[in-house]
């Protein structure tokens, strides 16, 4: 059963690492796969003393902890390096770090990415 | 430390139900998908079912189809596999796993036995 | 249906190095199936070796990694141990919530 799915075909692109990987720094990139996948976008970032540093932005292939998520979200306390995907067209486009730990109640840190 | 505890299995005769349960604990359990895996006796794993976060996505393997439910709840950070109409088929060792980014199971119960038989 | 294909036997002398394929029917495995490789001892709850085709996991030995050879997914155990001898399964993951795991490779560790 699948309530409320939402495809998902483009996804914020961006990588840090642009000039090593021979790719564009930052664009839309295109979700392709097998049409019996699902695609998600995700983003990956670092908190270096309170400075958001983007690593990556893109296309993620189909996993299971994706589905349903129509934002992306970190949930994971304090993490190296932060990770979220999400479902839905350049839905990585904004990310926020929501650490919820099992017994105290969360705080939200909304980040909006501004590659430079 | 990450902890998966599997109940409610037993014997049963063929036709009958058991519902097993999942306690999770040692993570925030509503922010990973789960998933259900099973070892007849003598035989390899099989994957029976696996539930998104939210529980808004389900699958199954197509012989419990129809058959078996699997739910969760994430305000009691608990699992579950309802069965019904089980066969002899059916026997086996259930383990509930826990499903980590990259969609692979990174830990495992210690298992619940169901046994199906008249 | 999908079949996913292991060796059902394999041994290996103390030392040695063995390497356990991974297939399936409907075409070749690559890093989108997301091969992992899981080691179980009778009576005991599988154990996660190496995730996502080649990672491996939490306090694993790097005497076990995974790759992709031709169109297999591969589990390499170099140096074995008589404390690997154990049933080893990989598992692809299909994508849209379903996984297939293979029929398992019972390795036994000669001597």
């Known amino acids: 059963a699948i309530l409320g799915r939402s495809e998902t075909q483009e996804c914020l692109f961006f990588n840090a690492n642009w000039e090593k990987d021979r790719t564009n720094q930052t664009g839309v990139e295109p979700c392709y796969g097998d049409k019996d996948k699902r695609r998600h976008c995700f983003a990956t970032w670092k908190n270096i003393s309170g400075s958001i540093e983007i690593v990556k932005q893109g296309c993620w292939l189909d996993d299971i902890n994706c589905y349903d998520r129509t934002d992306c979200v970190e949930k994971k306390d304090s993490p190296e390096v932060y990770f979220c995907c999400c479902e839905g067209n350049m839905c990585n486009e904004k990310f926020s770090y929501f650490p919820e730990m099992e017994v105290t109640q969360p705080t939200s840190n909304p980040v909006t990415p501004k590659p430079v | 430390e990450v902890q998966l505890l599997e109940s409610g299995g037993g014997l049963v005769q063929p036709g009958g139900s058991l519902r097993l349960s999942c306690a999770a604990s040692?993570?925030?359990?509503?922010?990973?998908?789960m998933s259900w895996v099973r070892q007849a006796p003598g035989k390899g794993l099989e994957w029976v079912s696996g539930?998104?976060?939210?529980?808004?996505?389900?699958y199954y393997t197509d012989s419990v189809k129809g058959r078996f439910t699997v739910s969760r709840d994430n305000s009691r950070n608990t699992l579950y596999l309802q069965m019904n109409s089980l066969r002899a088929e059916d026997t086996a060792v259930y383990y509930c796993?826990?499903?980590?980014?990259?969609?692979?199971?990174?830990?495992w119960g210690q298992g619940t036995l169901v046994t199906v038989s008249s | 249906q999908t079949v996913v294909t292991q060796e059902p036997s394999f041994s290996v002398s103390p030392g040695g190095t063995v390497t356990l394929t991974c297939g399936f029917n409907?075409?070749?495995?690559?890093?989108?199936?997301?091969p992992s490789w899981y080691q179980q001892t009778p009576g005991q709850a599988p154990r996660t070796l190496i995730y996502?085709?080649?990672t491996r996991s939490s306090g694993v030995p790097d005497r076990f990694s995974g790759s992709i050879l031709g169109n297999k997914a591969a589990l390499t155990i170099t140096g074995a141990q008589a404390d690997d001898e154990s049933d080893y399964y990989c598992?692809?993951?299909?994508?849209?919530?379903?996984?297939?795991f293979g029929g398992g490779t019972k390795l036994t560790v000669l001597g």
């Open positions: 796993a826990k499903v980590y980014y990259s969609s692979f199971f990174d830990y």
């Open positions: 996502n085709t080649n």
């Open positions: 040692g993570f925030t359990f509503r922010n990973y998908a």
């Open positions: 409907s075409g070749s495995v690559s890093t989108s199936y997301y």
């Open positions: 598992v692809l993951y299909m994508g849209s919530g379903i996984w297939v």
């Open positions: 539930i998104s976060v939210t529980g808004g996505s389900t």
